[in-house]
Interface confidence: low
C-alpha cells in the first residue's frame, strides 16, 4: 500500500495539461490516488492518472506517432509525386513533338500521302502514349499496323499513281505484300526494336515511380498496434501521472520503443534500398535506343528513310506486286 | 532529303526552349531525381531515430524519463528499466509486418526484379538479329543506334533532347504540391500534445 499523499499535493498541474487533450475534468483525480486499476502507467506511488486518462493518452500517443510518420515522409513523398507527374507530362510532350515532326516530314516530302498519312501517324502515336501509360498493346503490332497502313497509300500515290482510287481488296493484298516482300527493307524491324526497347524502359520507369508513391502512402497511413500505443504512452505520458510535467524521455529508451513500434516498417528498408539502386541502374541505361526521347524524336527520319528505300526499289516492287495483286486489280477494273 | 523547316513546328514553344542557358533535358532530370532519391536510401532504417529526434527527448537535461522513473541521462537505467516488467518488446518484433506492409514488400520485390531485368548489360548481342537479313549498302549499317536520324544526304537532324524548362512546371509551388494535403498538422487539438 503506497503512503498517503502529503496534504498539499494536488493534481492541479496534471489536470490543466489533460484539459488540453480532453476538455472536461471529470477523469482527473483531485489529489493523487493509488491507481491500482491502471494498466499502462503502473504507479510506484500515488498517481494523478485514471484508467480513462490512460485510454485517452494511448489514443493520443498513436495519433502523435502517425503524425510524426507523415511529417517524416512528406519531403520524400512530394519528391516522387512531383517527378512522376513531371515525367508523365514530359513523355507526353515528347510523343506530341515526335508526331508533329513525322507529320511535318510527310507534309514537306510527300504531300500526296497526306491526309491519310497523318491519320496513320496519329493512330500510331496514340498507341505509343497508351503503351507508356500501361495499356496492353503490342509494340510490334503498332509498328506493323503503321507500315501496313502506309504502304497501300505509298503504292497508289507514289509508285503507281495511275491506278484508280484503291479499293479494299487491293489494299488488303498490298498490306500482305508489304510483309511478304519486305518492301520497307529492315526499317520496320529496326523501328520495332528501337521503339519497343525505349518504350518498355519508359513504361517501367513510370511504373516504378508510381509504386514509390504507393510505398510511401502505405507506410504513411499505418495504424500502430495497441502494444505500440502502450509503449508510446508509457514513454510520452506516464511521467505526467507522477506530476513530472517537464521531464522528457531518455534518448536510448526512445530508440528502443521506436524500433519496437516500427519493426514491421523497417522491414521495407532492404527492398527500398534495392528499389532506389535498381532505378538508378535503369536510369543509367536510358540512353540511345533505350531513351524514348532519342528514339521517338528520330522516328520521322527513319520513316523517311524507309519510304526512300521503297522508292529506290520501286521498279522491281511494282512488277512483283503487279503480278501478286493482279487478281485484285482485275476485279477492281471490271 | 527530309527537310523540316522551323515554321512547321506545330508546338511553337519548343523553339523558345532552345535558348535556355542551363539545358535541362529529360536525362539530366532523371539523373537529378536519382541523386535526390539516393539521399533517401536509408529512409526506412533511419525512421525510428528520426521520430525520436522529432519528438521530445532529453538532450541537455541531466534527468530523463525511462518509462517508470526519473533517471540520470547517461545511466544504464536510462535505456533498460523502462522495458522491465512491461509487455515483451521481442514479442512485438516477432509478430512480423502488417499485411499491408507485406503486400507492399511483395510489390517492391516484383518491381525490383523488373528493373533489374531491364537493366541487364545492354551489349550488342541483344541486337545482333538486326543484321541477319541485311540492309543494302548505306541503309544504316549494323549499328542500329546510329540509324536514328538516318540518311546521310543532308537531312536536318532534330537535335536530341528537347529543353523542357519552358514547358514543364518543374518547381511546382509548394502550395500546389500534390500530397501537401497530407501535411502533418494538428487536428482539432487532438495531436498537439507534447508538453515542454
Amino acid at each position: 500500500q503506497p503512503p498517503p499523499p502529503p496534504p498539499d499535493a494536488t493534481c492541479h498541474q496534471v489536470r490543466s495539461f489533460f484539459q488540453r487533450l480532453q476538455p472536461g475534468l471529470k477523469w482527473v483525480p483531485e489529489t493523487p490516488v493509488p491507481g491500482s486499476d491502471l494498466q499502462v502507467c503502473l504507479p510506484k506511488g500515488p498517481t494523478c492518472c485514471s484508467r480513462k486518462m490512460e485510454e485517452k493518452y494511448q489514443l493520443t500517443a498513436r495519433l502523435n506517432m502517425e503524425q510524426l510518420l507523415q511529417s517524416a515522409s512528406m519531403e520524400l513523398k512530394f519528391l516522387i509525386i512531383q517527378n512522376a507527374a513531371v515525367f508523365q507530362e514530359a513523355f507526353e510532350i515528347v510523343v506530341r513533338h515526335a508526331k508533329n515532326y513525322t507529320n511535318a516530314m510527310f507534309k514537306n516530302n510527300y504531300p500526296s500521302l497526306t491526309p491519310q498519312a497523318f491519320e496513320f501517324v496519329g493512330e500510331f502515336f496514340t498507341d505509343v502514349s497508351l503503351y507508356i501509360l500501361g495499356s496492353d498493346i503490342n509494340v510490334d503490332d503498332m509498328v506493323n499496323e503503321l507500315f501496313d497502313s502506309l504502304f497501300p497509300v505509298i503504292y497508289t500515290q507514289l509508285m503507281n499513281p495511275g491506278l484508280p482510287d484503291s479499293a479494299l481488296d487491293i489494299n488488303e493484298c498490298l498490306r500482305g505484300a508489304r510483309r511478304d516482300l519486305k518492301v520497307f527493307g529492315n526499317f520496320p524491324k529496326l523501328i520495332m526494336t528501337q521503339v519497343s526497347k525505349s518504350l518498355q524502359v519508359t513504361r517501367i520507369f513510370l511504373q516504378a515511380l508510381n509504386l514509390g508513391i504507393e510505398v510511401i502512402n502505405t507506410t504513411d497511413h499505418l495504424k500502430f498496434s495497441k502494444d505500440c500505443g502502450r509503449m508510446l504512452t508509457r514513454m510520452w505520458y506516464c511521467s505526467y501521472c507522477q506530476g513530472l510535467m517537464m521531464v522528457k524521455p531518455c534518448g536510448g529508451y526512445c530508440n528502443v520503443v521506436m524500433q519496437g513500434c516500427m519493426a514491421g516498417v523497417v522491414e521495407i528498408d532492404k527492398y527500398w534500398r534495392e528499389y532506389i539502386l535498381s532505378l538508378e541502374e535503369l536510369v543509367n541505361g536510358m540512353y540511345r535506343i533505350y531513351d524514348m526521347e532519342n528514339v521517338l524524336l528520330g522516328l520521322f527520319s527513319t520513316i523517311h528513310d524507309s519510304i526512300q528505300y521503297v522508292q529506290k526499289n520501286a521498279g522491281k516492287l511494282t512488277t512483283t506486286i503487279g503480278k501478286l495483286c493482279a487478281h485484285s486489280q482485275q476485279r477492281q477494273y471490271r | 532529303s527530309a527537310y523540316y523547316p522551323e515554321d512547321l513546328f506545330i508546338d511553337k514553344k519548343v523553339l523558345k526552349v532552345a535558348h535556355v542557358e542551363h539545358e535541362e533535358t529529360l536525362s539530366s532530370r532523371r539523373r537529378e531525381l536519382i541523386q535526390k532519391l539516393k539521399s533517401f536510401i536509408s529512409f526506412y532504417s533511419a525512421l525510428p531515430g528520426y521520430i525520436c529526434s522529432h519528438s521530445p527527448v532529453a538532450e541537455n537535461d541531466t534527468l530523463c524519463w525511462n518509462g517508470q522513473e526519473l533517471v540520470e541521462r547517461y545511466s544504464q537505467k536510462a535505456a533498460r528499466n523502462g522495458m522491465k516488467n512491461q509487455f515483451n518488446l521481442h514479442e512485438l518484433k516477432m509478430k512480423g509486418p502488417e499485411p499491408v506492409v507485406s503486400q507492399i514488400i511483395d510489390k517492391l520485390k516484383h518491381i525490383n526484379q523488373l528493373l533489374r531485368t531491364m537493366s541487364m548489360p545492354k551489349g550488342r548481342v541483344l541486337d545482333k538479329n538486326l543484321d541477319e537479313e541485311g540492309f543494302e549498302s548505306g541503309d544504316c549499317g549494323d549499328d542500329e543506334d546510329e540509324c536514328i536520324g538516318g540518311s546521310g544526304d543532308g537531312m536536318i537532324k532534330v537535335k536530341n533532347q528537347l529543353r523542357f524548362l519552358a514547358e514543364l512546371a518543374y518547381d511546382l509551388d509548394v502550395d500546389d504540391a500534390p500530397g501537401n494535403s497530407q501535411q502533418a498538422t494538428p487536428k482539432d487539438n487532438e495531436i498537439s500534445t507534447f508538453h515542454n
Epitope: - | 531515430g49 522529432h54 509548394v174
Partner: antibody, heavy 126, light 106 residues
C-alpha cells in the same frame, strides 16, 4: 559562452562588393547550419542565406540569388557572406545566426536560430 | 517564396494576456518565435512551435494549428515591449520570417 561576432560592414557604392565575416566561439562550429539575416532600417527581419554544417548545402533568398555567396571555413570557425553587385535595397544590419538543427543521415530539420551576433551595418549609397 | 503574415501591432495592459498570430506556414515545418528588444539583436523565444529555450519565462508559450501559429504572453510586463517575429522554413529549406508585430505595453 556561445558567441557570434560579425565584421566587414561599411559604406559601399551601388554595384560594389563587400565581404562579411562571422567568427563563432563556444560551440562545435562544423556541426551546425548557419544563416545570414538582415534588417533594413525600420523594417522587419529578412533571411538572406543559409549553409549546412558540412558546407554541402547552400540556400539563398530570391532577392540575393546570383549576387551573394555564402561560405564557411570550419577550421577557422568562421562564416562568410560575399556580396557583389550591391544595390541600395541591400542597406541593412546583417546578422549572423546559428541554426538549431538535427541531422540524422539524410534527415536535416531546422529548429530556429538560437544564437545571434550583434550585427554589422552595410550601407549602399552613392 | 512563401509568406508568413503577422498583425503589425498588438497592445495590452500590464498583467494582461496577449496573443500574436502568424499565418501562412504551409510547408509542414515548425514555427519559431523571436523577440527583438529596441536596438538589440533578435533572441529566440519559442522553437518547434511550443518549446522554450532555457532562460525564457514560462509566461511565453507557442501553439500551432494547421497553417497558423500563435504566440501567447500572459502576465504582460513592461519589459515585454518589443518586436516579435515568427519564422519557419519553406520546402526548399529557405528560412522565412513574418513581417513582425510591435507589442506595446500600455
Amino acid at each position: 559562452e556561445v558567441q557570434l561576432v560579425e565584421s566587414g560592414g561599411g559604406l559601399v557604392q551601388p554595384g560594389g562588393s563587400l565581404r562579411l565575416s562571422c567568427a563563432a566561439s563556444g560551440f562545435t562550429f562544423g556541426e551546425y547550419a548557419m544563416s545570414w539575416v538582415r534588417q533594413a532600417p525600420g523594417k522587419g527581419l529578412e533571411w538572406v542565406s543559409g549553409m549546412s554544417g558540412s558546407g554541402d548545402g547552400t540556400y539563398y533568398a530570391d532577392s540575393v540569388k546570383g549576387r551573394f555567396t555564402i561560405s564557411r571555413d570550419n577550421s577557422k570557425n568562421t562564416l562568410y557572406l560575399q556580396m557583389n553587385s550591391l544595390r541600395a535595397e541591400d542597406t541593412a544590419v546583417y546578422y549572423c545566426a546559428k541554426e538549431m538543427d538535427y541531422q540524422l543521415g539524410w534527415m536535416h530539420y531546422y529548429y530556429g536560430m538560437d544564437v545571434w551576433g550583434q550585427g554589422t551595418t552595410v550601407t549602399v549609397s552613392s | 517564396q512563401s509568406v508568413l503574415t503577422q498583425p503589425p501591432s498588438v497592445s495590452g495592459a500590464p498583467g494582461q494576456r496577449v496573443t500574436i498570430s502568424c499565418t501562412g506556414s504551409s510547408s509542414g515545418y515548425d514555427v519559431h518565435w523571436y523577440q527583438q528588444l529596441p536596438g538589440r539583436a533578435p533572441k529566440l523565444l519559442i522553437y518547434g512551435s511550443n518549446n522554450r529555450p532555457s532562460g525564457v519565462p514560462d509566461r511565453f508559450s507557442g501553439s500551432n494549428s494547421g497553417t497558423s501559429a500563435s504566440l501567447a504572453i500572459t502576465g504582460l510586463q513592461a519589459e515585454d515591449e518589443a518586436d516579435y517575429y515568427c519564422q519557419s522554413y519553406d520546402s526548399s529549406l529557405n528560412a522565412i520570417f513574418g513581417g513582425g508585430t510591435k507589442l506595446t505595453v500600455l
